[in-house]
């Protein structure tokens, strides 16, 4: 059932969830936790559960993904009694239980932010002795990795009828705008191709047709700052040579 | 009902660190997170982190990181907020803030009760 | 971060008149879990701590005149007070409890016109 504590201060927004005779299992995490690439993150998540003054063995456990079937990114166990978890698996080393599972505290701490760890992440807590049970949270708490752009390829290609193109491949989050400049370009927004599937922070820009010799310049640029690249297109008997 | 009651000002030399009480009474102390907030003169209101009075887990916001920590003393219900390095831009009020209720299924983490904030002034 | 934008700056009202405040999310604020808005609105009189006004983006706290209303979803969010009383002059501020940083609007000054 649900009773709503309403104190002296006549608050009404703490809705306590009761089950009777005990609390129920639920797991609390916010929607988003937002962080720069290389920095690091603490992704909350606190539960309840049924069992009061469970004192048995416990793992807690982190899985990016989705629920209950993604790859396993930290897991740590509690022996009876102990309120140390020791950490049997941490991926690349870099995630650490910052809450104390036996105050119903599985926050986890990411270092060293990737782009690649931007995801969703589930906490899961397992009790094992005289009780068994478990519970995940469904929804998860989604990690937002922002980072300013890099430029990660940027290339002249042969094109049909013996002309150049360019390339300019940049990641970013949020994905950087692409802009070209060059001989007789002036500052051009060049054709952005979309992010790649699975490659959802890279961003591609073409130039389909190089009609001069001389410098090309990508720049890509977000929120968080910008980053530029050259290329020079030099022909000389019929070929290209082009560097970075 | 629920009170807040925070430490008073205090002055302080660029370098130095400063420690900020809040006494909470009225409600289960453990029961909901406690956040910093501060207010720069003049200015607007800057999430500094919470900690999680149970558990003593924290978070902080990234600009504070390494010179930021949050404590509490569950025994008298207080919590206490350090902020080292001081910087003649930390000269604000600091608000201590109670947060979302643990048991709470949907995280509802709005700051419902406030201190009355404690003035810090760093000046050489 | 979620940048939190509000305007204007400032508003001058007369009693008994409507006041408007807005805010706008750099990124929607709504999750699609539950369908709600983690936006909330806070008052500050000057000389004192902000208070808390609104929850879920139109949930009006417990002890909060009627006149104080809230709207809006997604990014863009609106407090509006439907007829302006003099204790009512303060700084409103929006903040998101989506996205860890919580970050507030700049803040917008209502006073009597």
């Known amino acids: 059932f649900v009773r709503t504590k309403i104190d002296t201060t006549e608050n009404l927004l703490n809705t306590e969830v009761h089950s009777s005779p005990a609390q129920r299992w639920s797991m609390q995490v916010p929607p988003e936790v937002s962080a720069e690439a290389g920095d690091a993150a603490v992704l909350p998540c606190t539960f309840t559960h049924p069992h009061r003054h469970y004192d048995g063995p416990l793992t807690a456990i982190w899985r990016a993904g989705e629920p209950y079937a993604g790859p396993q990114v930290f897991r740590c166990a509690a022996a009876r009694g102990s309120e140390l978890c020791q950490t049997a698996l941490s991926l690349h080393g870099r995630f650490r239980l910052l809450g104390n599972p036996r105050r119903n505290d599985l926050s986890l701490r990411v270092e060293r932010l990737a782009l690649a760890d931007d995801r969703r992440y589930f906490c899961r807590v397992e009790f094992a002795g005289d009780v068994h049970d478990r519970y995940e949270s469904r929804h998860g708490v989604r990690l937002h990795v922002t980072a300013a752009p890099r430029i990660v390829n940027i290339s002249v290609l042969p094109s049909p009828a013996h002309a150049f193109r360019a390339l300019c491949t940049a990641e970013g989050e949020p994905p950087p705008a692409l802009a070209w400049s060059g001989p007789a370009l002036g500052n051009s927004l060049a054709a952005v191709r979309s992010p790649r599937e699975g490659h959802g922070h890279l961003v591609t820009a073409e130039l389909p047709a190089l009609t001069h010799d001389g410098r090309y310049t990508c720049t890509a640029a977000n929120s968080l700052g910008r980053s530029e690249a050259s290329v020079y297109l030099f022909r000389f008997h019929g070929a290209s040579g082009a560097s970075t | 009902q629920v009170q807040l009651v925070q430490s008073g000002a205090e002055v302080k030399k660029p370098g130095a660190s400063v420690k900020v009480s809040c006494k909470a009474s009225g409600y289960t102390f453990t029961d909901y997170y406690m956040h910093w907030v501060r207010q720069a003169p003049g200015q607007g209101l800057e999430w500094m982190g919470w900690?999680?009075?149970?558990?003593?887990?924290?978070n902080y916001a990234q600009r504070f990181q390494g010179r930021v920590t949050m404590t509490r003393d569950t025994s008298i219900s207080t919590a206490y907020m350090e902020l080292s390095r001081l910087r003649s831009d930390d000269t604000a009020v600091y608000y201590c803030a109670r947060g979302r209720l643990l048991r709470f299924f949907d995280w509802l983490d709005v700051m419902d009760a406030w201190g009355q904030g404690t003035s810090v002034t760093v000046s050489s | 971060d979620i940048v939190m934008t509000q305007s204007p700056d400032s508003l001058a009202v007369s009693l008994g008149e409507r006041a408007t405040i807005n805010c706008k999310s750099s990124r929607s604020v709504l999750y699609s879990s539950n369908n709600k808005n983690y936006l909330a609105w806070y008052q500050q009189k000057p000389g004192q701590p902000p208070k808390l006004l609104i929850y879920w983006a139109s949930t009006r706290e417990s002890g909060v005149p009627d006149r104080f209303s809230g709207s809006g979803s997604g990014t863009d969010f609106t407090l509006t007070i439907s007829s302006l009383q003099a204790e009512d002059v303060a700084v409103y501020y929006c903040q998101q409890y989506y996205s860890i940083p919580y970050t507030f609007g700049q803040g917008t000054k209502l006073e009597i016109k």
């Open positions: 900690i999680n009075p149970n558990s003593d887990g924290t």
